[in-house]
């Protein structure tokens, strides 16, 4: 946890004191924010935001949709965060299927994982079709998969996020990429 000189306002402390936490579906999430000037907890995932004014955030029976970033903020506007993954074998991905890209820019396929301990977190073409040869992507289990430098030829490309589980591919819902020309 951060340490600051006396007199200077410091960020809140969170228990458990780690940047990432993995819990099983159905288990309890219990996060404690210690700060005399506690203001609120904020939860964020995809486009969803929730707030809680209690300094202890308790979710009695965690669901996959409780996966996300939990941020505690104090009266000085300083904050500290913990990211919680809720492992649910029946729901490996959270998805926001809107997928727009501008030509020559990067775009994010929003399929964060509920469990980071997976193999080959990747993009796959729909119906077993290969991805374009020049398509490159950067995976981030907390955010999704970033497609690098979108080409005009990718317009209407059908994609799934994918992980390997016990020798088989598990696919997310499908995404259709809409590309806006650069000019």
């Amino acid at each position: 946890q951060p340490s600051v000189s006396p007199g200077e306002p410091s960020p809140p402390s969170i228990h458990p004191g780690k940047s990432d936490l993995i819990v099983r579906v159905g288990d309890e999430i219990r996060l404690l924010c210690t700060d005399p000037g506690f203001v609120k907890w904020t939860f964020e995932i995809l486009d969803e935001t929730n707030e809680n004014k209690q300094n202890e955030w308790i979710t009695e029976k965690a669901e996959a949709t409780n996966t996300g970033k939990y941020t505690c903020t104090n009266k000085h506007g300083l904050s500290n965060s913990i990211y919680v993954f809720v492992r649910d074998p029946a729901k490996l991905f959270l998805v926001d299927r809107s997928l727009y890209g501008k030509e020559d820019n990067d775009t994010l396929v929003r399929c964060p994982l509920t469990d980071p301990e997976v193999t080959n977190y990747s993009l796959k073409g729909c119906q077993g079709k290969p991805l374009p040869k020049d398509l490159r992507f950067i995976p981030d289990p907390k955010a999704g998969i970033m497609i690098k430098s979108v080409k005009r030829a990718y317009h209407r490309l059908c994609l799934h996020c994918s992980v390997d589980q016990e020798g088989k591919s598990v696919l997310s819902e499908k995404f259709i990429l809409k590309v806006r020309p650069a000019f």
Epitope: D20, L113, P116, E117, V118, T119, N120, Y121, S122, L123, K124, G125, P130, L131, K133, L135, R136, F137, I138, P139, P141, K148
Partner: nanobody, 128 residues
Amino acid sequence: QVQLVESGGGLVQAGGSLRLSCVASGRTFSSYAMGWFRQGPGKEREFAAAILSNGLTTYYADSVKGRFTISRDNAKDTVYLQMNSLKPEDTANYYCAAAFTPEFRDGGIWDDASVDYWGQGTQVTVSS
């Protein structure tokens, strides 16, 4: 600058096991995705396995799936490749790789153009 030093290569019989290690020095090891590529005699360099900076999310080429396991120990600035059920076709020079922002292509193959740092390699020979 990151320096990568591999060890653990050697001669092993088909069906045997080896564990490769790669120690990183320099920048913050825990911020980098790490992985292994290999180059067999007369072949192009190919991707074998990778592990993201979180230490949990892994990638394997089809040719090594189910036989090789990649892991990392951020406290020791080390990445490992446990190789089981080795085959003669696994004979190659094995190179450790590090990337701050690894880029992948179809099939979860780490594109070596996005590798920031390479090790010198360690030789693995599998005899039949």
